[in-house]
Amino acid sequence: SDKLYQRKEPVISSVHTKVKGIAEVKEEIVENGVKKLVHSVFDTADYTFPLQGNSFFVMTNFLKTEGQEQRLCPEYPTRRTLCSSDRGCKKGWMDPQSKGIQTGRCVVYEGNQKTCEVSAWCPIEAVEEAPRPALLNSAENFTVLIKNNIDFPGHNYTTRNILPGLNITCTFHKTQNPQCPIFRLGDIFRETGDNFSDVAIQGGIMGIEIYWDCNLDRWFHHCRPKYSFRRLDDKTTNVSLYPGYNFRYAKYYKENNVEKRTLIKVFGIRFDILVFGTGGKF
């Protein structure tokens, strides 16, 4: 529809998303030194987080550090925190990789392992691998409804991707249902040749591209979106450069008048919705 006589105008867009789905999570916890399997149900409020801009996030995996409180404790053993004497620790030292401020003492962590003591949220979060398989592996069956309103102000034309009479029980399919605005997360990954279960372990970033190529001439009128998908994070990143997508957040509570928190390292997929295109009119 690239007619030389047409006046082209870039699209102005707003996006709103709604994620739906329920996941059963089997968490392995240690209680009084005994490993237990805990079953819980995660709904939208548990696995989505509000994001700015044209993005939404779905948690697929997590690591918990429960019962943290502000006190002194030994650092988690790493190359940078293990010590053989107080000389290996420095009062007031804050290493960028550390979780607290050193007291200058080298103390027993466990058995014959000694680490630098810190003032921090204790116990210190362990350095451990994300669970395999991902705890919310079933998130591949979640669906997202994408509402996209677009505007070409110069042409005084507004439309949206959801038209009246749309069957909202549909699921997007590249050939069989290319106009359906409801996407199964696992299908998005299949389209890019990625395995959802693999990405769910460490997290990642996925682009949902909505391309509007609009011919606004009355006799050739056509203005419908074309959906495509693109993996945006670096799949080849090595371990030292922090692969995937994760962040930490905390749930705070009081126990016997002492402020405590549960620290959660969240792994998941951030979906960036990229809307672009032009409207052309004679």
């Epitope: 190359r79 940078r80 293990l82 010590c83 053989s84 000389r87 290996g88 620790c89 420095k90 030292w93 290493d95 960028p96 990789q97 030292s240």
Partner: nanobody, 129 residues
Framework: EVQLVESGGGLVQAGGSLRLSCAAS????????MGWFRQAPGKEREFVAA???????DYGDSVKGRFTISRDDAKNTVPLQMNSLKPEDTAVYYC???????????????????????WGQGTQVTVSS
């Protein structure tokens, strides 16, 4: 990753001198802090000397003033000059490397064996009285 090979060990009389050398393979040698450690039979591995990628040095209490560590980034070597040797300096001497690419080893940590990821096979130094 670096491979480390120590050389220069041997038998020397008390009061004598010896120069150990550690040769490192790898183009990123200049990004490593380098250390010398020693281990006498039946004893724990002990810190001798270290030099950071930016030239800061540290020495074990028992060798201060007698041993000197340096580095030659052009030749990828770390010499350890040992003077006024004593029988108690007898041990296997190990060269070690700590990657500083993603963050420098703090000076107060240069002596900690835990900081060093790569180790050589060692060279024997025997000081007779």
């Amino acid at each position: 990753e670096v491979q480390l090979v120590e050389s220069g060990g041997g038998l020397v009389q008390a009061g004598g001198s010896l120069r150990l050398s550690c040769a490192a393979s790898g183009r990123t040698f200049r990004h490593y802090a380098m250390g010398w450690f020693r281990q006498a039979p039946g004893k724990e591995r002990e810190f001798v000397a270290a030099i950071s990628s930016y030239g800061s040095t540290d020495y074990g209490d028992s060798v201060k003033g007698r041993f000197t560590i340096s580095r030659d980034d052009a030749k990828n070597t770390v010499p350890l000059q040992m003077n006024s040797l004593k029988p108690e300096d007898t041990a296997v001497y190990y060269c070690a490397a700590a990657d500083e690419t993603l963050g420098a080893v703090p000076n107060f940590r240069l002596h900690e064996k835990y900081e060093y990821e790569y180790w050589g096979q060692g060279t024997q130094v025997t000081v007779s009285s």
